[in-house]
């Protein structure tokens, strides 16, 4: 039975905005036509789900309304954007990948990418 | 290096019960995915069920009803409850265990459903 590689780089800086994006790869043991990822928040050996999609292959990543993720889809490669960081949400990101249809089902998880989020020094109070 | 040991398995009557267990021992990543994959006699090897260690459950379609999946997170071990067995859940069940960037299997524990 074939294990699934599932890569992410290891460190990733959120931008001044608090916009953090990072590719999730995964080496497809299979020809999956739907593919679920999730997107798992580890800090302090605590775990927090952030998003999760499900997609059939070439189409559109569509995560819900309300999620602070959007992505993108290409091959086997998933491009994923968190938007509206925080410092307090600086951790370790994990990426979960599923292979849901046709069976086999395979599952594979990321090293994980450490994201830094600083926020942003206030501007000073100008005097004119 | 991480092992993982499953136990429980041994012939049972159609309709009965049985409990497996797996422990895992080494380094395991605090966020993690324990499972049970069978695989019968000449077949591929299915996925049964898995959890996640922060409670995630996941059941196969032919899981659903009769077996249950649990996990001691304190003890880093795993179970499957099979209730209403049937001649047909004759397979050998492994253990699965994901970690961040990695994959384990136990060695599997025979599991005979006959009269």
């Known amino acids: 039975c074939k294990a699934m590689h599932v890569a992410q780089p290891a460190v990733v800086l959120a931008s001044s905005r608090g916009i953090a994006s990072f590719v999730c790869e995964y080496a497809s043991p299979g020809k999956a036509t739907e593919v679920r990822v999730t997107v798992l928040r580890q800090a302090d050996s605590q775990v927090t789900e952030v998003c999760a999609a499900t997609y059939m292959m070439g189409n559109e990543l569509t995560f819900l309304d309300d999620s602070i993720c959007t992505g993108t889809s290409s091959g086997n490669q998933v491009n994923l954007t968190i938007q509206g960081l925080r410092a307090m949400d600086t951790g370790l990101y994990i990426c979960k990948v599923e292979l849901m249809y046709p069976p086999p089902y395979y599952l594979g998880i990321g090293n994980g990418t450490q994201i830094y989020v600083i926020d942003p020094e206030p501007c000073p109070d100008s005097d004119f | 290096e991480v092992q993982l040991v499953e136990s429980g398995g041994g012939l049972i009557q159609p309709g009965g019960s049985l409990r497996l267990s797996c422990a895992a021992s080494g380094s395991i990543s605090s966020y993690n995915v324990m499972g049970w994959y069978r695989q019968a006699p000449g077949q591929g090897r299915d996925l049964v069920a898995h959890?996640?260690?922060?409670?995630?459950?996941m059941y196969a379609d032919s899981a659903k009803g009769r077996f249950t999946i649990s996990r001691d997170n304190a003890k880093n071990t795993l179970y499957l409850q099979m209730n209403s067995l049937r001649p047909e859940d004759t397979a050998v069940y492994y253990c699965?265990?994901?970690?961040?960037?990695?994959?384990?299997w136990g060695q599997g524990t025979l599991v005979t459903v006959s009269s």
């Open positions: 959890i996640a260690s922060n409670g995630e459950i």
């Open positions: 699965k265990l994901w970690v961040l960037g990695n994959d384990y």
